[in-house]
């Protein structure tokens, strides 16, 4: 069964800077990635990002760096400045989109006792919804 | 709950212009769709896709509107446009906005799969 991953990090130099970082662990090719905050896109959540292999990756405030680590994994450098940055308790979703899977979504959030620059290495985040 | 409102529908004449304006809102959060498209119903006829628009900003227009009518999204994502010239008798109809998302992110055929919808303004082509 595909899963997806979820990591959040607060960057040590700049302690209202997040780093998101979100993987698909399954087979088929991903179409489409969403990055949202707040809560899952068009749920409660804002989207911050959207990664598509061949046309490209448009972001919004208060994200600054969106990017293809690998063909199945991304990440996402977030602003930390004015009343839209982040905070630590803040949920990040990824949802992914792959053929011939479907969508598969999941959130997380900075670990509570998280020290900056400090993360835990990448786990499965609880799936959150499979269309 | 995601609205959709409509605005920029009047009566203009033969050849004239509009320009028609669409605002995503959702409360507690900014939603910015995938796609988001205008539709039209003209008295007496079923509704028909006019103009699609997704997130990266790949158009598509019924063959009926192409070269007169143009379809725009704002940086921010959630505001759609539609620029109509050249307009003609045929083009008077109820103009809706629709959005929603599709898995790859580009518009669906037809408009399958926008589960919002506007409730339309009217533009009405007439000397």
């Known amino acids: 069964t595909p899963e997806v991953w979820v990591q959040v990090r607060m960057e040590a130099t700049e302690l209202s800077s997040f780093t998101i970082r979100c993987g698909f662990l399954g087979s088929g090719s991903i179409s489409l990635v969403t990055v949202s905050w707040g809560g899952p896109n068009g749920a409660g959540g804002t989207t911050l990002a959207v990664l598509h292999p061949e046309r490209g990756i448009r972001q919004w405030a208060p994200a600054r760096q969106a990017r293809w680590e690998t063909q199945s994994s991304i990440s996402l450098i977030l602003e930390g400045s004015g009343a839209s940055s982040p905070c630590a308790n803040t949920t990040f979703c990824c949802k992914f989109a792959s053929f011939p899977e479907g969508s598969w979504e999941a959130c997380g959030s900075l670990p509570p006792s998280s020290d900056p620059g400090l993360s835990a290495p990448p786990t499965p985040a609880p799936i959150l919804r499979a269309d | 709950q995601v609205q959709l409102v409509e605005s920029g529908g009047g009566l203009v004449q033969p050849g004239g212009s509009l320009r028609l304006s669409c605002v995503a809102s959702a409360s507690g959060f900014t939603y910015r769709p995938y796609c988001m498209a205008w539709f039209r119903q003209a008295p007496g006829k079923e509704r028909e896709a006019v103009a699609g628009?997704?997130?990266?900003?790949?158009?598509t227009y019924a063959d009926s509107v192409k070269g007169r009518f143009t379809a725009s999204r704002d940086n921010a994502g959630f505001s759609l446009y539609l620029q109509m010239n050249s307009l003609r008798a045929e083009d008077t109809a109820v103009y809706y906005c629709?959005?929603?998302?599709?898995?790859?992110?580009?518009?669906?055929?037809?408009?399958?799969?926008?589960?919002?919808w506007g409730q339309g303004t009217m533009v009405t082509v007439s000397s």
């Open positions: 629709a959005a929603g998302d599709s898995p790859d992110g580009r518009c669906p055929p037809l408009g399958q799969g926008l589960n919002y």
């Open positions: 628009i997704d997130i990266f900003g790949g158009t």
